[in-house]
């Protein structure tokens, strides 16, 4: 029999609003095992996937998605799913991203850095919708 | 190489259950949705249905109760169930862009089915 | 379930010429959008997706624009090996699912 798979988290560091021009990443996180985890924008077409894959902790495996200089066009909704064969996931909930225009240096953001979720996540509507990852170093320019 | 390709296609009699495989070859199948379209002699393309990476299957709303579309690891398959002759066409499966679901640029040269008494 | 109503079916042009093609979605669609191009005997090869990006190989003679209801293919400078039959396709999976139907095509000859 199959095991249930948990579905996955999805944080952004430093923070979820982010000023134009820095940077910012999502971390995906599941469970030990994952062999690929996909980065999805709502109403969007794109994705990002990657198999670069780290262990986060003996119980939880973690994929990180990179954008450099955060554009206006970067701001909305984000969600993870992970490929554990078999089978895939059920979607993250929605993470959102906030850009905003940037009063200090591309080093000053608002957010405190490890924030994440808060209330910029919302449930994903996962009715229909199944179509984005991660590691450190890999770019997110299908997101774009 | 990267390609799919279309197989299980011939003359059957009305009725007759039909089942067309779509094979995967040079990628990872589970990442990719893949498509079913048809193009009856001398018609426009109509889609047909399609089997997506996480496991979702959909179906044009005339295709419902006709066709049954599965997957396995290296296959797609479309199963029609009670054909007629309305549905002797050429059978096309298809993978979306890497990055991309809006568009399907890997396509199989497609097989022919005949539906005849 | 969603229709694409593609126009104009068919449409003559001069080599080096440039030929509009349009489609509009019954429903929005945002930019999950496709257009092919098929060859008589030939399986359909992708020419834009995303409703205005260019396919791998396209030259960019070959343009996507619009979004939402409203799309438009146009093939500027026009060559012989040009014709063929376009296609417009909904890929939409979205919130809701919308089917995957295409346009009825547009017949391009050149002159």
């Known amino acids: 029999q199959e095991e249930d798979l948990p579905r996955p988290s999805i944080s952004a560091e430093p923070g979820t609003v982010i000023p134009l021009g820095s940077h910012v990443t999502f971390v995906c996180r599941g469970p030990v095992g994952v062999q690929t985890f996909r980065l999805e924008r709502d109403s969007r077409s794109t994705y990002n996937d990657t198999e670069d894959v780290s262990q986060a902790s003996p119980s939880e495996s973690e994929a990180r998605f990179r954008i450099d200089s955060v554009r206006e066009g970067n701001a909305g909704l984000y969600r993870c799913i992970y490929y554990k064969p078999p089978k895939w996931s059920e979607q993250s909930d929605y993470l959102e991203l906030l850009v905003k225009e940037s009063s200090g240096g591309p080093d000053s953001p608002d957010t405190e850095p490890g924030s994440s979720a808060g209330p910029t996540q919302r449930p994903s509507d996962n009715s229909h919708n199944e179509h984005a990852p991660a590691s450190q170093g890999l770019k997110a320019e299908h997101l774009y | 190489e990267q390609s799919v390709e279309e197989s299980g296609g011939r003359l059957v009699t009305p009725g007759t259950p039909l089942t067309l495989t779509c094979t995967a070859s040079?990628?990872?199948?589970?990442?990719?949705?893949i498509q079913w379209v048809r193009q009856a002699p001398g018609k426009g393309l109509e889609y047909i249905g399609a089997?997506?990476?996480?496991?979702y299957t959909y179906y044009a709303s005339w295709a419902i109760g006709r066709v049954t579309i599965s997957r396995t690891s290296t296959t797609v398959d479309l199963k029609m169930t009670s054909p007629t002759t309305e549905d002797t066409a050429t059978y096309f499966c298809?993978?979306?862009?890497?990055?991309?679901?809006?568009?399907?640029?890997?396509w199989g040269p497609g097989t022919l089915v005949t539906i005849s008494s | 379930e969603l229709d694409l109503t593609q126009t104009p079916a068919s449409v003559s042009a001069a080599v080096g010429g440039t030929v509009t093609i349009k489609c509009q979605a019954s429903?929005?669609?945002?930019?999950?959008f496709g257009w092919y191009q098929q060859k008589p005997g030939q399986s359909p090869k992708l020419l834009i997706y995303?409703?205005?990006k260019l396919a791998s190989g396209v030259p960019p003679r070959f343009k996507g624009s619009g979004s939402g209801t409203e799309f438009t293919l146009t093939i500027s400078d026009l060559e012989c090996a040009d014709a063929a039959t376009y296609y417009c396709?909904?890929?939409?999976?979205?919130?809701?699912?919308?089917?995957?139907?295409f346009g009825g095509g547009t017949e391009v000859e050149i002159k």
């Open positions: 298809a993978r979306h862009i890497d990055g991309d679901y809006s568009g399907y640029a890997l």
């Open positions: 040079g990628f990872s199948l589970y990442k990719y949705n």
């Open positions: 089997s997506t990476y996480a496991g």
């Open positions: 429903q929005s669609i945002d930019t999950w």
């Open positions: 995303g409703a205005s």
């Open positions: 396709q909904n890929t939409y999976y979205g919130v809701r699912y919308l089917g995957g139907a």
